[in-house]
Structure formats: C-alpha cells, structure tokens
C-alpha cells in the first residue's frame, strides 16, 4: 500500500494501490536550498542536478566528523519527497540543488540570499518554464531575507518554505513570515499538528496551510537504495512544493496568487485538532491540509477567495492593524476582531494605489486584528463607497450606485469609544442587496465591484442572544466575499471568514453575565462569476 | 578567498578615490535603520548585509562598498567586502567591526543594514 502521506494528499478518484496522479510536474523545475545531497540515490538519480553553488558556514564542534552520509541526509530526503521515483509527490519534476546548509544543518541568512540571487540570475540567463523554490529552513525574523523572497516571487517564482519546528508563531521566523512565500506547517497521519519533542510545528497567521510532516518515508543518504523516515516542517513544505509543481505543470500560466488560492481551495478543511495550538493562535491558524486537485483542469470557473489576518495592533488607544491582499488579488471585504470586544470597527482605504483593510482599537482594548477577504477576480473594478455618520435617527446607509456594480462587503467604523452602549452598528444589506446600513454614529463602507458576470447575494443567520458564535455559510458554487455582524444588544467581538463560512463572535456571556435580549446575526455576502464558469466550459 | 595583499590594495584605491572627491554626498531626510536577529544565539555579529535603495545600480553598490572601506580604513579598521548583490536586492555583504555601523548607516543610498544570522534545517 502507498505511504500514508501520499495517500493523504491524493484525491479519492486517484486512490488506488499505487500513487500515480496525472502529470508528474514534468514542465516545472524545483530548486532546493538545503544541505548537500546524494545525487546518485536510486530515488532521485537523473532527476536532480547538483549546481556548483555552495555557501555554508563552518561546522561547530570540538571533534567534528564529516561523513558524507550525514552531510547529505536532510537534502537527499527532501529531494526524494518532492520528486522521488517511488516515494515522491511529483515524480516528473526536475530539481536543482544549492548547498546553503552545512553538515549540521546550519546556514546563514547571507548564504541563503546569495543562493536566491543565484536562482534569479540563472532564470534571467536561461529562462525555463515555471520555477518552484523550496526553502526547508528557518531562522529568526529577517527583513532582508523576506525582501529577497518578495523580489523573487514578483519575478514569477513560486517559493515554498517550512513554517519552522519551534512550536511558536511562524511570523517570528524567516522566510516563513514573508507574505509572498507559501508557508507550510506539519501534520501527522491523524491530521494532528506534529510534535517534535518539546517543540513541534509552528502555527499562526503566517502559515498558509499544513501538509504531511511526520514519519515521512524518503531517500536515505546512508546508501543509494536506502530509505528512512524523517519528520518536520521541511517534509511538509516538500509535499507542497511537489503539489505546486504538478499544478504548474498542468497549468503553466498560473500566477503565484492563483496557485496559492488553488492550494487553499483544494486542501482538506477543518480536519486539524486546533486544541494543540495556543488558544490565542487558533483563530489565526488555517485549518487546512494540502491535497492535489481532483482534476488538473476545470478549477478556473471558481471564484477563489482567502482570508488574510493582520498582525495584532497592540493595545494603545489609537492602535490600528492593517491586512493586505497580494498584488494580483482584490480586497472584496474587510472585517475586524478583538478578543476584548473593545474596537472601533474597520474600514477599507487606499494605500499605494491598492485597497487595504484597517481595523481600529478602542480605549481599554487589548488590541484588534484586521481581516481581509482577498479574491481572484479578473478584470475587476472595485471601489469603496463611504457614508459618514448620519444625523438622522434612522442610521447611516450606503449603496453601490454605479451601473453593474455589486456589493461584495460592508464595513463599519466609529469614533465613539463604545458604540455598544449606544446601540451596536448595524450592517443590513438584506432586502436591498446593494446597500449597507449602519448605526448613525458610525461611518459605513461598502465594497462595490464590477466584473464580467459577477453576481452576489446576501445570506443571514440570526440566533437569540446570548450567543458566543453564530455562523452562516455560502452554498455550493458560491464563494464567501463578505462577512459582518448584525448584533442585537449583546457585544460583538468581530466577524471573520473561515473558508466559505462567515463567523460572528460575541462576548463570552459567562464572563460578562449579560443576558441581553435581541439576536446575534451573521451576514454573509456570497458571490459567483458566471463569466469564469463560461470561460472554463469553453476551455473543455 | 582573496589574500590580505589584495584587500590592502583595494583599501588604498578606495582611499584615493575618496580624496579625489568621487564619492557622492549622503541624501538628506532619510535615516537608514539597523536590524538584527531577535534571538541572540542565532546572531552572527561581524558580518552585515548592507541593503541599498531599490533603484541603486551595481556600479553605485560597488562605489558605496569602496567608500565604506575607505572611511573604515581612515579610522584604522579593516573591512572585507564578501559579496556585492545585484539581481534581487542592491547591496553588499561586508565583514567589519560593529563599531562601524553608525558610519555605514550614513552612507549614500543605504536603505537598511542587517546583521547576518543563522538559519537551520527544519
């Protein structure tokens, strides 16, 4: 039977005794920045070209024994996981290895930078097909390493990295914290986060998704036919690099943004036991385990969206948090969340010619998060319509008045310290799908978009208060673009999208003692693109 | 690895070019920043990545590196340029004393400087 990790990433229609998905990534080149490798291992022989690049620090130790089998161990295993004949994910992918880690698995930021520069120069000298760069390494947060990754990503290269094995917030490490990089955490055969001694997989908002990373069978550098089991976020990242190679081989024109959205879309959802993560990180950590798409074509019709969380604002009175979408993505809605419930809402605003989502902390608040809903919407023309706080008692209204523009999200921002004591903000698009309505002391922001064939509708789900969490999901074929709350009198902590579900959180009634009447209502804006669906059908 | 004589020759040339007034004056209104790894054991003091502003050309990177060497030499410090970056980020990698950071941050075109640090297989 096939190894558990290959079985896990394979969609049911390909599950047989053998792992043989279509197209093994043959049009894609995968660069591996790691230790030296044993290139004549049967698993990877003829598949991996060892470049002449080497930039490593000296090994430490009073008596260091340099044994080739030890020096090659990490890199050989990962090369096998990506493209190995028997135990590889993308058996057709060709690889190039750069040595940036020494025999003890240690390298430097500068050596890694020079390696990334080497790849860029190689790409310019001899342009090939799609490139995937696998970085199965981590160091402390590095501005320069993140910047280099950003530049390489903007040159069309897909970078995949390990989240790190520190049982910590991945945002504290590089290149895991670089937004342009696909950052991968590790799960085991039980879909649990991987524990590595006292440590384990990293987590948090800088992780894009998880993948198999425990007890992974792969090439051993001990001999040319040996296999060994290894664990770590490197192994998880290698799986995603392999999946990416296969997706890019099937659709070579995919951009990084499109690839990332597809990786998220085809992942197994909500299978990870979140109790393993620290409580404050659970909401920020994606509950996604990577998998291959069920078919190599036909995903194009889907309107893809993902949720991007900002860094925490910090607790100061005027603190704000900003969430940004990738350059090729559209910000279709913006929401905010605060564990203390003290916040002053959120707004979409232009920054450097692009919309961003900004959340505002309130006096006495412990800080806020901004949550952006970032979508792939070709030929979109989106704008934000704002209504300032209304004088009239009926509240503030704003709608999408331009011909052909549809409402994709509503945001609300207020200056008063605790709007909840007056009457909470109300965003009520129901009945008038192109309109947001809010509290008269709040400014209301409507995200209005025009794109070929784009249609949207509003879905609500209300439960009588007190209620800690209310959800509403978009049905099959529709994608969640906007998520907001229609609170009654009980205090709302915020709203955010998890996959295709809008989640509204209210203050824990057990701590507040609140038994207020009214309802807590989650409002989802669900969209689809008939244009994308037609374009997809024409391709087939 | 270059030999010590080679390093010395480069320093002398750099000094002469500065005396000839070939180096540009630093720009006003922008302050370069210094960054280092938050995890002390992973720091590698003595090696620094000097990152220059985005549109800096390779020739300017090389000139800035030489200028740093010249100014350091005048203060009695030996420095070694380990690599000049171009293609991804403009800048250079330099082996030098941390005492020179204040000086380096004032060089023209400098955006920020980051102390080198360790990365590890995961």
């Amino acid at each position: 039977s096939i190894p558990w990790n290959l079985e896990r990433i394979t969609p049911p229609r390909y599950r047989a005794d053998e792992y043989q998905p279509p197209d093994g990534g043959s049009l894609v080149e995968v660069y591996l920045l790691d230790t030296s490798i044993q290139s004549d291992h049967r698993e990877i022989e003829g598949r991996v070209m060892v470049t002449d690049f080497e930039n490593v620090p000296e090994e430490d130790g009073t008596r260091f024994h340099r044994q080739a089998s030890k020096c090659d161990s990490h890199g050989t295993h990962l090369a096998g996981v990506v493209s190995g004949r028997d135990a590889g994910v993308a058996k057709g992918a060709s690889m190039r290895s750069l040595r940036v880690l020494n025999c003890q698995g240690k390298g430097t930021v500068s050596g890694t930078l020079i390696g990334l520069e080497f790849i860029r120069k190689s790409q310019l000298v001899q342009p090939v097909g799609p490139l995937v760069v696998l970085l199965p390494l981590a160091g402390g947060y590095s501005r320069v390493l993140n910047a280099a990754c950003q530049r390489l990503a903007r040159a069309g290269v897909v970078l995949v990295t390990a989240a790190g094995n520190f049982r910590d917030d991945a945002c504290l490490y590089s290149p895991a914290s670089a937004p342009e990089v696909i950052t991968v955490g590790a799960t085991n055969a039980q879909d649990q986060p991987v524990t590595l001694g006292t440590l384990g997989t990293n987590f948090g908002r800088c992780v894009d998704l998880f993948a198999p990373g425990e007890d992974i069978i792969g090439a051993s550098s001990y001999c040319s036919t040996c296999f060994v089991s290894q664990s770590g976020t490197s192994q998880a990242a290698a799986h995603v690099a392999g999946i990416a190679a296969m997706m890019l081989s099937a659709e070579p024109e995919l951009t990084l943004a499109e690839l990332r959205q597809r990786l998220i879309h085809f992942s197994a959802k909500d299978v990870i036991n979140e109790a393993w993560f620290p409580e404050d990180q659970r909401v920020l950590t994606p509950n996604l385990v990577a998998a291959l798409p069920p078919s190599t074509h036909g995903a194009g019709w889907q309107l893809f969206c993902r949720t991007v969380w900002s860094a925490h604002s910090g607790p100061t009175r005027m603190a704000t948090a900003v969430a940004r979408c990738a350059p090729d993505e559209e910000l279709l809605s913006c929401s905010s969340f605060s564990r203390s419930g003290k916040r002053r809402g959120e707004r979409m605003e232009a920054q450097g010619g692009k919309l961003v989502c900004r959340a505002h902390n309130a006096f006495g608040g412990e800080g806020v998060y901004a949550i952006a809903r970032c979508c792939l919407l070709p030929q979109a023309n989106c704008s934000v319509h704002t209504a300032p706080p209304a004088e009239a008692s009926m509240g503030t209204r704003v709608h999408c008045h331009q011909q052909g523009h549809v409402l994709t999200g509503c945001s609300s921002h207020w200056e008063v310290e605790d709007l909840g004591t007056h009457k909470p903000p109300v965003l009520r698009p129901r009945g008038q799908p192109n309109q947001c309505v809010g509290h008269r002391e709040a400014s209301i922001h409507a995200s209005c978009c025009h794109a070929p064939g784009l249609e949207c509708k509003v879905k609500e789900h209300g439960i009588p208060a007190p209620q800690e969490q209310v959800t509403v999901a978009c049905e099959e074929g529709w994608t969640l673009t906007g998520c907001s709350a229609l609170p009654g009198t009980s205090h709302v902590l915020g709203a955010y999208a998890v996959d295709n579900t809008c989640v509204v959180r209210s203050r824990d009634v057990s701590t507040t003692g609140s038994t207020s009447e009214g309802a807590v209502t989650a409002v989802a804006i669900c969209c689809r693109s008939r244009h994308l669906a037609q374009a997809s059908q024409e391709l087939q | 690895q270059e030999d010590e004589d080679g390093d010395y020759e480069e320093l002398v040339l750099a000094l002469r070019s500065e005396e000839d007034g070939l180096a540009e004056a630093p720009e006003h209104g922008t302050t370069a920043t210094f960054h280092r790894c938050a995890k002390d054991p992973w720091r590698l003091p003595g090696t620094y990545v000097v990152v220059l502003k985005e549109e800096t050309h390779l020739s300017q990177s090389e000139r800035t590196a030489r200028r740093l060497q010249a100014q350091a030499a005048r203060r009695g410090y030996l420095t070694k340029i380990l690599h000049v970056f171009h293609g991804l980020l403009p800048g250079f990698l330099v082996k030098m004393s941390g005492d020179l950071l204040e000086l380096a941050l004032k060089l023209p075109h400098v955006d920020y400087i980051e102390e080198d640090s360790s990365v590890f297989a995961q």
């Epitope: 130790g61 003890q104 770590g232 | -």
Partner: antibody, heavy 122, light 111 residues
Framework: QVQLVQSGAEVKKPGSSVKVSCKAS????????MHWVRQAPGQGLEWMGL????????YYADSAKGRFTISRDNSKNTLYLQMNSLRSDDTAVYYC???????????????WGQGTTVTVSS | QSALTQPPSVSGSPGQSVTISCTGT????????VSWYQQLPGTAPKLMIY???KRPSGVPDRFSGSKSGNTASLTISGLQTGDEADYYC???????????FGTGTRVTVLG
C-alpha cells in the same frame, strides 16, 4: 511515554573504567542530540558533554576531556558514557538528557534519565 | 567550567511570589538561550523554562522567565508547597563551547 532508562549503579576502584548506558523509548532517538550531566553528592549539576543526533559533532566539559567519551548506537536507541581513569571525585549520579533541538537550535534538556550512581572508592 | 551565579536560597509563603536570579556573562546568558530546571528531592531535574521565557506543555503558567543583559530570572507566583525544590538555570557558553549550569537555588515554602 517518552523516557530515558539508564543502566544500574556501579562501584569502581580509582584508575578503573566504566561504561554507563541510556536507552531511549517512545521518540525518534536519531533526531535528537544527547547530553550527559552529573551531580556529586550534595552538589549542583555539572555538564559533562553533548553528542549530535547523528554522532557528527561532540562537545566535552574540561573535566571530561581526554578521560570521558560519549557515543551512541542509533540502531539500538542507546547513548553511552565511557569513563576511564576514574578518580574519587568522579563519584556522582550521572544523568543522560535529551537536547530539545532536533538539529541545532536549542541545547536545553527536556527529557532526563533517572540517573546512574557511580561510586569511585578504594 | 565556571558556573552561573544564583542565590543559595529564597523563601516565601504560600500564594506569594519569589524570584530567582541567575548571573552570567556575554558569552552565556548575554547572548545565549537560558533554561530553568526544577529538581525535587531525590529525583532527576525537570525542564521548566526554555528560550528565556517559554514553558514546555504541562508546566504551570505560575512559572515565568525573563532576561535582561547578562542576568536571567525565574519567577514563581502563587507559591505552593509542591514548588519546594532546587532550581538551576542553564545556558550554552560560546567561549567554552559547552553548557553551564547555575550554582542552584533552594526554594523553601514557609509555614
């Protein structure tokens, strides 16, 4: 559960040798560095040495250099401490302990053996 | 191997907080991760804190660590009788290429 089980107590004469073992269970032994630490009666902890997960790098305390050798057999999940030319001041409880960093990042010891008492007396 | 310096003993009543200091140099505490170990009478040491201030799972949040310059500290808040033990700090020392422990501190819970 994760544990390190050490060999039994030893009584030795000065100048003789002894080999203490430490068997690991319920974790992937070959992924972790291993330490030896000793504690003389009524005294504090004294670090003796560390061996990398794959045996490729080793460190010793000054008091252990030349007389003590750390080795491991990853196929048997076992760590060893070979002590030669024993002296009376080597009398102590010897603990094996797992380094928490899978490869390199942390030296802290997160799992300890129960200890082996070595008495050196004429 | 020169040890890190700790006070020989500290004491406090149940519910109180006690802080143990650990002083070293720039080659150990100043530039290396610090860990803290608890050794109950007659047992092997147990890791309580690593990387200055992180707790392994199962260690109560009453135990916290901090570092300033070349000195690290362990604070035990809400002191309990079960906390009576010897506590050792530990750090890698880059100049010695070896691990160094503190001299040890006996924590006594009064009453």
């Amino acid at each position: 559960q994760v544990q390190l089980v050490q060999s039994g107590a030893e009584v030795k004469k000065p100048g003789s040798s002894v080999k203490v073992s430490c068997k690991a269970s319920a974790f992937t032994f070959d992924s972790f560095g291993m330490h030896w630490v000793r504690q003389a009666p009524g005294q504090g902890l004294e670090w003796m040495g560390l061996l990398w997960s794959d045996g490729s790098g080793e460190y010793y305390a000054d008091s252990a250099k030349g007389r003590f050798t750390i080795s491991r057999d990853n196929s048997k999940n076992t760590l060893y401490l070979q002590m030669n030319s024993l002296r009376s001041d080597d009398t102590a409880v010897y603990y094996c302990a797992r380094a928490m960093g899978a490869i390199y990042y942390y030296y802290a010891m997160d799992v300890w053996g129960q200890g082996t008492t070595v008495t050196v007396s004429s | 191997q020169s040890a890190l310096t700790q006070p020989p003993s500290v004491s406090g009543s149940p519910g109180q907080s006690v802080t143990i200091s650990c002083t070293g140099t720039s080659s150990n505490i100043g530039n290396q991760f610090v860990s803290w170990y608890q050794q109950l009478p007659g047992t092997a040491p147990k890791l309580m804190i690593y990387e200055y201030n992180k707790r392994p799972s199962g260690v109560p949040d009453r135990f916290s660590g901090s570092k300033s310059g070349n000195t690290a500290s362990l604070t035990i808040s809400g002191l309990q009788t079960g906390d009576e033990a010897d506590y050792y700090c530990g750090s890698w020392d880059s100049s010695l290429s070896g691990y160094v422990f503190g001299t040890g501190t006996r924590v006594t819970v009064l009453g």
